[in-house]
Interface confidence: low
């Protein structure tokens, strides 16, 4: 189990000719927000296919109105990460797709209206618990700078976030210098020693020896923080390519606010400002109402009278979850019966059946002979989904309709001749032979 | 399209009863019905989930909830309002609505979240 954190640095018009001067007309006012659909693998983009690793949704940014011929500024935009949590293991592959929405503020009937202003996408390759890793993608003339990481929950550990460490209460039988790993009691696991000297605080390894520099931070031994001048922005997690600075070890580090909380320090231990709709010791308690379109993958939110009232996310076929992010495997259920193939459409279940079955889940098993004649006097056989003719004499084939000749076989033993007879056949035996087949 | 049309209405005493229909030609996501008395705004009264995927979630407006009682017939493609207790202030011209876009945000006491409208049906609680 873990977290995948995404921190939107910037967005606004891109570099060239013909850009946007800004996102918001004079006439209205407006806010951006944000939100991230997460698949496994390298898989196919499409918004519409569902962000099986989770999805989420930023907070409202702060209401911006542009000044006509006042030169554009920096679009305002929320506060906190966009963190979407994953329960199984991290993929290592993924592909996502961030959508930045426009909120206008005008005097609609109904309510505020949403657009959508532009959807990134892309492929990506991330092992938990790395550093943060930067990224700039246009679209358009849109251009948005992000940031974004993997991180596991404790008690799960390494990059994929499925093995679990935590110290027994049991004295370890673990010898000097290694730290027990459930959940085999008696697995051990060395931890990795970094290069000697490798800064606690801003360092760290995935190979023994090694000293890789967190964010902010350089050196051999990632001891010396990066010039600060030429950051990008000054909020959220920073870049050693752009040289911000990441603050040292505090209550805050790893932000334990959710749902794009803030955190600041407080004397005894931390303190977390949250987002409209989330409350609770680290912001993990949603009121989140329909206003704030909190179902994805097609989940219809439903809200009743009160505008305060808690929100019930109805998902369609295939989904699950309180916001609908969840895939669900219905075939994992093995619904259909009779050995029947099972095909998630996600808009519905489809069950292929084997032969001689039918119905939707394959639980009619079909008489295979009704319909089915039998030529010249063969009789029908069911059985295993299918039906066969068990054929009169001299006949054979699928219906018994191929005249057989019966001595094609050569059914007489020890040299006896076969005639063809209306009955059945006849063989003459050679001297010293007898038997219907001239076995004796 | 969907084309919605409404049976039931009428005249009655206070504490009497009555039960509206609206059926409705394609399928729906959601219906339900809204109000409006003489010089007074429209008013949502009532909301029911249709689409199989819903299970006949009811919401209601707290002035009739205890005493409305909103129903569907799948097969039918009805949906049916139950008023019990009736009071003057009931009194209104009773119009159907439905849902038929696919959307991630739906708030049902939002007269523009309905696609389709029926024509209404006048109710008369007398004192």
């Known amino acids: 189990a873990g977290v995948f954190e995404l921190q939107i640095h910037s967005f606004g018009p891109g570099p060239g000719p013909g850009a946007p001067r800004s996102p918001c007309s004079a006439r209205l006012p407006c806010r951006l927000f944000f939100r991230v659909c997460l698949k496994p693998g390298l898989s196919e983009e499409a918004a519409e296919s569902p962000c099986a690793l989770g999805a989420a949704l930023s907070a409202r940014g702060p209401v911006y109105t542009e000044q006509p011929g006042a030169p554009a500024p920096d679009l305002p935009l929320p506060d906190g990460l966009l963190q979407v949590p994953f329960r199984d293991a991290w993929p290592g592959t993924f592909s996502f797709i961030i959508e930045t929405w426009r909120e206008e503020l005008g005097d609609q009937i109904g309510g505020p209206a949403w657009s959508l202003l532009a959807r990134v996408a892309g492929r990506r390759r991330l092992a938990a618990g790395g550093p943060w890793a930067r990224d700039i993608q246009r679209a358009g003339a849109w251009e948005l700078r992000f940031s974004y990481r993997a991180r596991c929950e404790p008690p799960a550990v390494g990059t994929a976030c499925t093995r679990l460490c935590r110290p027994r209460s049991a004295p370890s039988r673990c010898g000097p210098g290694l730290r027990p790993c459930a959940p085999l009691e008696d697995e051990c696991e060395a931890p990795l020693v970094c290069r000697a000297g490798c800064s606690p605080e801003h360092g760290f390894c995935e190979q023994p020896g090694e000293c890789r520099c967190l964010e902010g931070w350089t050196g051999p031994l990632c001891t010396v923080p990066v010039s600060t001048s030429s950051c990008l922005s000054p909020r959220g997690p920073s870049s050693a390519t752009t040289g911000c600075l990441v603050p040292g070890p505090g209550p805050c580090d790893g932000n334990p606010c959710a749902n794009g909380g803030s955190c600041s320090e407080t004397p005894r231990s931390f303190e977390c400002t949250c987002p409209r709709g989330f409350y609770g010791l680290r912001c993990e308690v949603s009121g989140v109402t329909c206003a704030d379109g909190p179902c994805f993958n097609g989940g219809l939110c439903v809200g009743g009278a009160d505008p305060d009232s808690a929100y019930i996310c109805h998902c369609p076929p295939g989904f699950q979850g309180s916001n609908c992010e969840k895939r669900v495997d219905r075939c994992s259920l093995q619904p259909c019966r009779n050995g029947g193939l099972c095909l998630d459409l996600g808009h519905a279940l489809r069950c292929r059946c084997r032969a001689g079955f039918a119905g939707p889940r394959c639980e009619h098993d079909l008489d295979d002979c009704a319909g089915r004649a039998c030529a010249n006097g063969g009789t029908c056989v069911e059985g295993g989904g299918a039906h066969r003719c068990s054929c009169a004499l001299g006949f054979g084939g699928r219906d018994c309709r191929e005249r057989a000749d019966p001595c094609a076989a050569r059914p007489c033993a020890h040299g006896g001749r076969c005639y063809a007879h209306f009955s059945g056949l006849v063989c003459a035996c050679a001297p010293g032979y007898m038997g219907a087949r001239c076995e004796f | 399209q969907v084309h919605l049309v409404e049976s039931g209405g009428g005249s009655v005493q206070a504490g009497g009863s009555l039960r509206l229909s609206c059926a409705a030609s394609g399928y729906t996501y959601f219906m339900g019905w809204f109000r409006q008395a003489p010089q007074k705004e429209r008013e949502w009264v009532a909301t029911?989930?249709?689409?199989?995927?819903?299970?006949?979630?009811?919401y209601y407006v707290d002035s009739v909830k205890g005493r409305f009682a909103i129903s569907q017939d799948n097969a039918k493609n009805t949906v049916y309002l139950q008023m019990n207790s009736l009071k003057p202030e009931d009194t209104a011209v009773y119009v159907c609505?439905?849902?038929?876009?696919?959307?991630?945000?739906?708030?049902?006491?939002?007269?523009?979240?309905?696609?389709?409208w029926g024509q209404g049906t006048q109710v008369t609680v007398s004192s």
């Open positions: 029911i989930g249709t689409g199989d995927i819903f299970n006949g979630a009811a």
């Open positions: 609505a439905a849902v038929q876009s696919k959307s991630s945000n739906y708030v049902l006491r939002d007269a523009s979240t309905y696609n389709y």
